[in-house]
């Protein structure tokens, strides 16, 4: 005959454990029911009565099957640099993540404890590693033949436009300015940028070599977080 199903509370067989969604109550020395997520144990079990569960109050939660006497408090409201990506309910805690343009400088078990603004690369410097949810932007100087004239946490250095006749040579913080004859872009079409303050880095203030002698310059790879460098700026 099949073994009879035991109903909680019941005394476990020696050496055996309680079943799924049950716990062993040391005082009653019985296997008793756990409370479902969103509830907590209002009255613990005895040898003759099972656990009495009650719903979590507002702003409290339990995420797992449990026998805790009180529900856990939801975390405080998200700060102004955060967005609430998961609301506080009886079954889950509030989760705050950093809003766009910020990254998590100090994480916690779920969500973020401290957000910080993504570093902005100043003119003459470009993004060499895009920011992520958990890492800051890295800025590096624009290589010869490239420029960035923005203060931005997303802009990479871009190649100077190629002019038939150069009016003003480009530098690290300014695109080349062509005379009225139409330029050939070395990049996707875009507006001609007006002169900006010249970078203090002498290596980038020299006229760019003609294409025939320019070094084969290429890729764009990003890197890990770094402390604020001279190429970065605060908000």
């Amino acid at each position: 005959l099949p073994a009879q199903v035991a109903f909680t509370p019941y005394a476990p067989e020696p050496g055996s454990t309680c079943r799924l969604r049950e716990y062993y109550d040391q005082t009653a020395q019985m296997c008793c029911s756990k409370c479902s997520p969103g509830q907590h144990a209002k009255v613990f079990c005895t040898k003759t009565s099972d656990t009495v569960c009650d719903s979590c109050e507002d702003s409290t939660y339990t995420q797992l099957w449990n026998w805790v006497p009180e529900c856990l408090s939801c975390g405080s409201r998200c700060s102004s640099d955060q967005v609430e990506t998961q609301a506080c309910t009886r079954e889950q805690n509030r989760i705050c993540t950093c809003r766009p343009g910020w990254y998590c400088a100090l994480s916690k078990q779920e969500g973020c404890r401290l957000c910080a603004p993504l570093r902005k690369c100043r003119p003459g410097f470009g993004v060499a590693r895009p920011g992520t949810e958990t890492s800051d932007v890295v800025c590096k100087p624009c290589a010869p033949g490239t420029f960035s004239n923005t203060t931005s946490s997303t802009d990479i250095c871009r190649p100077h436009q190629i002019c038939n006749v150069v009016a003003i040579p480009g530098n690290a913080s300014m695109d080349a300015v062509c005379t009225s004859t139409s330029p050939t872009r070395s990049m996707a079409p875009g507006a001609v940028h007006l002169p900006q303050p010249v970078s203090t880095r002498s290596q980038h203030t020299q006229p760019t070599p003609e294409p025939s002698t320019a070094p084969s310059t290429s890729f764009l790879l990003p890197m890990g977080p770094s402390p604020p460098a001279e190429g970065s700026t605060g908000d």
Epitope: A128, P144, T146, Q203, T217, S218, F219, L220, L221, G224
Partner: antibody, heavy 118, light 109 residues
């Protein structure tokens, strides 16, 4: 003139470790990342990782992260790539480079041949 | 890690147009992958041609152009020259690392 000069060829036994150097000149080493790329015989390129010489921060390809260590010494303008637990599939030419999909500062070392054989 | 796939080989006639593509195993290629294209000629140094999906590197001839086509990165060579015969590699950025494709051997014939 920008130059990246790598150390010479190496022959190693399986399980050993190899450390290759890459001496840069002609630019400020902290201005650009240094990358390491593998090219096995008859095969394509495999990006291994990179170092920011300014602060030593590194990023590695998932396929290599357990075995590779990339460092940079700004006092000697030299970057290093150490690959451990060598196996025969690691027989390849290894290149250091300033190629960085974000900067157009594109220079490559001459390559270092590593042969792993018992 | 992600796998980046390219055509193993392509052939183009001198003066003709050819498009090389670069597919990501993780989904459509976007501008956040900062697609790069690198050229390797036998016995010569590598040369970066395209960065940031569609920016030609300084000194790269206008016949090379980069774009996104149907969820893939693409390198189009318009008016192929004999000296363009080479191996072409694409590289895609994935949050904190680069992945190269297997390369396309381009023959100008």
């Amino acid at each position: 003139e920008v130059q990246l000069v790598q150390s010479g060829a190496e022959v190693k036994k399986p399980g050993a470790t190899v450390k290759i150097s890459c001496k840069v000149s002609g630019y400020t080493i902290t201005d650009f990342y240094i990358h390491w790329v593998q090219q096995a015989p008859g095969k394509g390129l495999e990006w291994m990782g990179r170092v920011d010489p300014e602060d030593g921060n590194t990023e590695y390809a998932p396929n290599f992260q357990d075995r590779v260590t990339i460092t940079a010494d700004t006092s000697t303008d030299t970057a290093y790539m150490e690959l451990s637990s060598l196996r025969s599939e690691d027989t390849a030419v290894y290149y250091c480079s300033t190629w960085d999909g974000f900067s157009y500062f594109d220079y490559w070392g001459q390559g270092t041949t590593v042969t792993v054989s018992s | 890690q992600a796998v980046v796939t390219q055509e193993p080989s392509l052939t183009v006639s001198p003066g003709g147009t050819v498009t090389l593509t670069c597919r990501s195993s993780t989904g459509p290629v976007t501008t956040n992958n900062y697609a790069n294209w690198v050229q390797q000629k036998p016995g010569q140094a590598f040369r970066g041609l395209i960065g940031g999906t569609n920016d030609r590197a300084p000194g790269v001839p206008a016949r090379f152009s980069g774009s996104l086509l149907g969820g893939k990165a693409a390198l189009t060579l318009s008016g192929a020259q004999p000296e363009d015969e080479a191996e072409y590699y694409c590289a895609l950025w994935y949050r904190n690392h680069w992945v190269f494709g297997g390369g396309t051997k381009l023959t100008v014939l």
